[in-house]
């Protein structure tokens, strides 16, 4: 299960127990507050670690405009049910019987309701636009140099194919990452855009949830690349249903 | 060899609690899951939840949230359940149990709540 | 959470024969991940605690007689006691260890005649 035998960790994932008590002292490695038996040589999803957290966050434009349907996560942190599979369930309740729907990256997309509540099928962020602010340079990172770098840390770190990452987008100071992958697209064994953007946005926020490794040194020809500022929206493959007074509002 | 010895049967009150023990030998007892589970004749087996001594993670069954409550002590490699509350329906078999493959349980602390 | 099945409840067969217990989980125990099937099978003699047979659905225990045979996938899971014997009177307890709360199925009592 690539979780390292000799001291019986989780490379992947630092919210989780791990313990040589796998067939022949096999180490194996649960992650917090579910319990389930996680693969360390992959990232975790984001709906096991949202648990697991909450059992111990102009002219020339070439940057994207998201779209009147993008997401933003605005309601912060909640303990979120998991299916079988460790994926958002699509109808996720409080402990006051408050219901909402959600997507694949555990973003409310409904208003809120109470237990009649019907969310049918949990519906697939397809598009994720992460949108960051680096701190002030001596002058601007060359775009292509950004981009090979960024593309560089989504497959090393974050283990995406490369073909996921649609664009990067860069206009002084404002890096935009694009991230495509639908369903069609996405095979057995491949990291969930929605995963991988999750592992960056903790990365980037300084509360990596690698083990035992450094915290981000993105670097761009040496250069380092400090983020001040992080939004990520998200785009579901079916717009999200909100009433018209959140929309005026 | 791995060992889990438990505390002794226990005849209580209705409406007191009790605290009973599991000592473990015979290995690193920070490096095991120790749960704990209820056998009641004609109610089967059921766990009650788990505790990681190395890091005193505690997981509980909802149906035992404040009714057990599972700790360890390092020290002296020893892992406790105390039951509050009590009435005929906590009458049973108690064990504690080391998780995982090569399962190794304690041979069990009876409990009987009488008046 | 996750309710275990088992099926029969109990059964009466002579030293010699072949018995095969059911397990049915309410959801599959198939971890997608690791690729293991989280499913524990339990023998309980009288006045013992239970003792662990097969481990992720098919691992036999060390020191676990070759006559006892786990297998499944999924959601429906086989404990198999080839050439039973008289000390294999107990009662059997499949139980899931996929993700919290660890549930155990009612059990199947297994006598000899």
């Known amino acids: 299960h690539t979780a390292a035998q000799d001291n019986c960790t989780c490379p992947t994932n630092k919210m989780t127990v791990c313990s040589p008590d796998g067939p022949g002292g096999r180490c194996q490695c649960r992650a917090l507050g579910s319990g389930m038996a996680v693969d360390c040589s992959t990232l975790t999803s984001k709906c096991l670690l949202l648990k697991a957290r909450m059992s111990a966050p102009k002219n020339a434009r070439t940057l994207v405009r998201p779209s009147e349907h993008a997401l933003v996560d605005n309601d912060g942190l909640y303990d979120p049910d998991c299916d079988p599979e460790g994926r958002f369930k699509a109808r996720q309740c409080n402990q006051t019987s408050v219901c909402w729907c959600v997507n694949s990256v555990g973003v409310r997309r409904t208003d809120k309701g109470d237990l009649s509540l019907r969310c049918d099928e949990l519906v697939r962020t397809h598009h994720i636009l992460i949108d960051l602010r680096h701190r002030p340079t001596a002058g601007a990172f060359n775009h292509s140099d950004l981009d090979a770098e960024l593309r560089r840390l989504f497959r090393e770190r974050y283990r995406l194919h490369p073909k996921f990452v649609a664009a990067v987008h860069y206009e002084q100071p404002t890096i935009q990452i694009e991230l495509r992958q639908n369903t069609s697209q996405k095979a057995a064994g491949d990291v969930d855009i929605g995963d991988a953007a999750y592992y960056f946005e903790r990365d980037i926020k300084g509360e990596s949830l690698f083990q035992g490794r450094g915290g981000l040194d993105l670097r761009v020809r040496g250069e380092p690349l400090q983020v001040e500022r992080t939004l990520i929206y998200y785009l579901d493959e079916i717009p999200p249903k909100f009433s018209m007074k959140r929309l005026t509002a | 060899q791995v060992q889990l010895q438990q505390s002794g049967p226990e005849l209580v009150r209705p409406g007191t609690s009790v605290k009973m023990s599991c000592k473990a030998a015979g290995y690193t007892f920070t490096k095991f899951w120790i749960g704990w589970v209820k056998q009641r004749p004609g109610h089967g087996l059921e766990w009650i939840g788990n505790?990681?001594?190395?890091?005193?993670?505690?997981n509980y069954n909802e149906n035992f949230k404040g009714k057990a409550t599972l700790t360890a002590d390092t020290f002296s490699s020893t892992a406790y359940m105390q039951l509050n509350s009590l009435t005929s329906a906590d009458s049973a078999i108690y064990y504690c149990?080391?998780?995982?493959?090569?399962?190794?349980w304690g041979q069990g602390t009876t409990l009987t709540v009488s008046s | 959470d996750i309710v275990m099945t088992q099926s029969p409840s109990s059964l009466t067969v002579t030293a010699g024969e072949k018995v095969t217990l059911s397990c049915k989980c309410s959801?599959?125990?198939?971890?997608?991940?690791?690729?293991?099937?989280?499913l524990t099978w339990y023998q309980q003699k009288p006045g013992q605690p239970p003792k662990m047979l097969i481990y992720w659905a098919s691992i036999r225990e060390p020191g676990v007689p070759d006559r006892f045979t786990g297998s499944g996938s999924g959601t429906d899971f086989t404990l198999t006691i080839n050439n039973v014997q008289a000390e294999d009177l107990a009662v059997y307890y499949c139980q899931h260890d996929y993700s919290y709360p660890f549930t155990f199925g009612s059990g199947t009592k297994l006598e000899i005649k």
């Open positions: 959801q599959s125990l198939l971890n997608s991940g690791t690729q293991e099937n989280y």
């Open positions: 149990a080391r998780e995982g493959s090569s399962g190794y």
């Open positions: 505790i990681y001594p190395g890091g005193a993670y505690i």
